[in-house]
Amino acid sequence: HTAAQDNCTCPTNKMTVCSPDGPGGRCQCRALGSGMAVDCSTLTSKCLLLKARMSAPKNARTLVRPSEHALVDNDGLYDPDCDPEGRFKARQCNQTSVCWCVNSVGVRRTDKGDLSLRCDELVRTHHILIDLRHRPTAGAFNHSDLDAELRRLFRERYRLHPKFVAAVHYEQPTIQIELRQNTSQKAAGDVDIGDAAYYFERDIKGESLFQGRGGLDLRVRGEPLQVERTLIYYLDEIPPKFSMKRLT
């Protein structure tokens, strides 16, 4: 099933236009912005979601120390170029012919250059560290309960297999979720960790991408887990290439 047949909507992506014009009158959904057909039985790629977002109206200690090569998405929103599979193209350029290379989650991994800049391949982000700070609670959450609930959330809401949730670290009030997925581990049909992390990030911000599904209601043994800040670090299979100028 690519979409809910009865009312022809896309359960996994509200930023779509759906109509019963598929084969045999089946419901078919296309992403806003790109017009690309999307599979509504799984998460839509982050590239297509960002493109749709840009086209939409604007009103719309056990802890891990991120490695020196970890990237944070400081550039924010941009209108990306996506390939026919919906993945980010390795090279992204803006309207003023400023170009840069991105990784598989669309985060810049080189200095900005001009149209002569070459990005030979799309470098895979194989390790994502989601750093959360939760609001004060009566007491600390039980670590194993928290671990189990977060794995269940990623499995049931984002369809990410628990084997890709490498670890859940907790030192009140900081929670860190490590997602790991090498190219060799990702089988056909597996949700990409970058897409799962993006859906999670939007859920945490109260901007759910799901159609007609309630917002994120995360509870650990009945106690609500409310997040007050999120930081996401991205680690690529090949370290990023920035000049020393950026690092000073």
Partner: antibody, heavy 120, light 110 residues
């Protein structure tokens, strides 16, 4: 050949305890989740608990209320279910069932079951 | 809590006939539904997963359909060996769940 085999069932008095085992063979325990499901004589299937052994994540049916505990010994490819404060209503065949290794919870491999009888 | 309701509880069918069993979920479960066959003294055997995908080694006389909250198991060209109890199971969530299985449907072959 992939197999599950339960053991540890038998006759137990009301209020007593029992520990059931489920031995897995022919596959790597760590790549799957496993459930305990029970069936009272002449009744339907009732899910009890689920464990993802690789991370020791455990989940229980709402009615369990701490009476039962699921656990695993990964090196021995063995799953356990500790049954406490047993009553006659717990008389059933107890099955262990493995998920298919996908993101949903469908069970494609079942053991033959072990019978637990609670009676004085 | 997702509750699964199965109908009918029992159905009689002649050899060669067709039987339909329905399963209703109390909430939308997309296509996360499995069907099992159980014969007396045996463990359940998976027939269908993802609402309509036939499990390995299962006869194509069995078919599943549905999406969201309404699902159907159809057995066509019924054989004596199909006499069993059939269970549906929501395979979406194990959080705050009483029982993911439906109550069962007994198929009696005449």
């Amino acid at each position: 050949q992939e197999q599950l085999k339960e053991s540890g069932g038998g006759l137990v008095q009301p209020g007593g305890s029992l520990k059931l085992s489920c031995k897995a063979s022919g596959f790597d325990f760590n790549n799957y989740g496993v459930s305990w499901v029970r069936q009272a004589p002449g009744k339907g299937l009732e899910w009890i608990a689920y464990i993802y052994p690789a991370f020791h994540n455990t989940y229980y049916a709402t009615w369990v209320n701490g009476r039962f505990t699921i656990s695993s010994h990964n090196a021995q490819n063995t799953l356990y279910l500790q049954l406490n404060s047993l009553t006659a209503a717990d008389t059933a065949t107890y099955f262990c069932a493995r998920d298919a290794g996908s993101v949903d919870y469908n069970f494609n491999l079942w053991g033959p079951g072990t019978l637990v009888t609670v009676s004085s | 809590d997702v509750v699964m309701t199965q109908t009918p509880a029992s159905v009689e069918v002649a050899v060669g006939g067709t039987v339909t069993i329905k399963c209703q979920a109390s909430k939308n479960i997309d296509s996360n539904l499995a069907w099992y066959q159980q014969k007396p003294g045996q463990p359940p055997k998976q027939l269908i997963y993802a609402a309509s995908t036939l499990a390995s080694g299962v006869s194509s006389r069995f078919s599943g359909s549905g999406y969201g909250a309404e699902f159907t198991l159809t057995i066509s060209g019924v054989e004596c060996a199909d006499a069993a109890t059939y269970y549906c199971q929501q395979a979406l969530t194990i959080g705050n769940v009483d029982n993911p299985f439906g109550g069962g449907s007994e198929v009696v072959v005449k």
